[in-house]
């Protein structure tokens, strides 16, 4: 038997993936555990094997279908269970009635690219990945720029309160190496959270023009 407190958290990427993390304080030996998803009105169910990510937490991804298929909608409720093997039987360790569109975490934005760069400014664009058509334009973004000698944690956050897949960074220093990241969040959902940060995009501003001799 497993004692101790348990935490079971899952997020829907808005298309065809539910990612789950299960934390358990009590000692689990070499027990095999899985997450089982049982929608309330769909003719499918899905299972994934929980794999350790730390001493006391396990994670897995429920792949519900093709990456861009809309497998769940706002009307769905999915019963999610953590099941662990106990001898020949499976024991329910955690259970939740999961409302996918109340627990959203999108995929990180992709295809970051420099559209135009000057000495003091840089225009960058990106794309969102595997985001549901249900959001229409109801998305927001956060961006941050890594300056030389600073850490990501120190970088000020720039907020875009609308679906705008580009940004013009101003007041940059000429001939300087920067990195840029962006993340996305739907406006919908009580427990919705930010996507992971995108892969950093490195860029360099142009050198200042040399002054003319008099």
């Amino acid at each position: 038997a497993v004692n101790g407190t348990s935490q079971f958290t899952c997020f829907y990427n808005s298309r065809a993936n539910i990612s789950c993390v299960w934390s358990q304080d009590g000692a689990l030996q070499d027990t095999s555990c899985q997450v089982h998803a049982w929608p309330d009105r769909r003719r499918w169910n899905q299972t994934c094997e929980l794999l350790p990510v730390s001493q006391a937490s396990w994670a897995c991804n429920l792949i519900l279908g093709a990456p861009d298929s809309q497998k769940l909608t706002t009307v769905d409720i999915v019963t999610l269970r953590v099941l662990c093997r106990e001898g020949v039987r499976w024991r329910v360790m955690a259970i939740q009635d999961f409302k996918p569109f109340e627990n959203l975490r999108l995929m990180a934005p992709i295809s970051l690219q420099v559209v135009h760069v000057e000495t003091h400014r840089c225009n960058i664009s990106w794309e969102i990945s595997q985001a549901s058509h249900y959001f229409e334009r109801h998305l927001e973004f956060e961006a941050r720029t890594l300056s030389p000698g600073h850490t990501w944690e120190e970088a000020p956050l720039l907020t875009l309160k609308q679906k705008q897949e580009w940004i013009c960074l101003e007041t940059l220093t000429p001939d300087t190496q920067y990195e840029f990241q962006v993340r996305v969040k739907p406006l919908q959902g009580e427990f919705t959270t930010w996507s992971p940060w995108s892969q950093p995009l490195a860029f360099r501003t142009k050198p200042a023009a040399l002054g003319k001799d008099t």
Partner: antibody
């Protein structure tokens, strides 16, 4: 096998209420949403609302909000739909249907006639 | 509300014909579309769910396709028992809605 059996035809006066029952068998009653759909004579299908017998959760079509009440009795695996303040345009066949994939099994229908 | 516009509203065909009925949703509904067959005085019968999946017991001559806003029900070779009214239905978001129906008659 899955069956949904509905109560018999009703004739009601305008302003009255009607309560239609739908008895389910052949599957785990608590597990699947039961929908209510109506069809006026010679017309199409109109969704009224749904109830999940296990939890009692309900979703209505806003068109019927305040006039429709859905309940369930888990001991008899029966769902009820009550429509109040009846008017002549409520004359229709009322169906219950299970939602699994889509509306997979349907009751035989209950004819409700509203006439003074 | 999402409107489901079915066409044609009526259709005359002969046994053995290939018949196509279309349904257009006013908003993207993914693949959350079903098709039903209804004969006079009877309850609707489920044919297709998730746009293209046939319920067990439904003859293979019935097929569904489409995603997003445009959907099709095809009957590859009409049989005498197929003459009926057909409805499309979206269950992607509340309130669930139906097409107005296509009446398939014998030519």
């Amino acid at each position: 096998q899955v069956q949904l059996v509905q109560s018999g035809a009703e004739v009601k006066k305008p302003g009255a209420s009607v309560k239609v029952s739908c008895k389910a068998s052949g599957y785990t009653f608590s597990r699947y949403w039961i929908q209510w759909v109506r069809q006026a004579p010679g017309q199409g299908l109109e969704w009224m609302g749904e109830i999940l017998p296990g939890s009692g959760s309900i979703n209505h079509n806003e068109k019927f909000q305040g006039r429709v009440t859905m309940t369930r009795d888990t001991s008899t695996s029966t769902v009820y739909m009550e429509l109040s303040s009846l008017r002549s345009e409520d004359t229709a066949v009322y169906y219950c249907t299970r939602h699994y994939g889509s509306f997979d099994y349907w009751g035989q229908g209950t004819t409700v006639t509203v006439s003074s | 509300d999402i409107q489901m516009t079915q066409s044609p509203s009526s259709l005359s065909a002969s046994v053995g014909d290939r018949v196509t009925i279309t349904c257009k949703a006013s908003q993207n509904v993914g693949t959350d579309v079903a098709w039903y067959q209804q004969k006079p005085g009877k309850a609707p019968k489920s044919l297709i769910y998730s746009a293209s999946y046939r319920y067990s017991g439904v003859p293979s001559r019935f097929s569904g396709s489409g995603s997003g806003t445009d959907f099709t029900l095809t009957i590859s070779s009409l049989q005498p028992e197929d003459f009926a009214t057909y409805f499309c239905h979206q269950y992607s978001s509340y309130p669930f809605t139906f097409g107005q129906g296509t009446k398939l008659e014998i030519k």
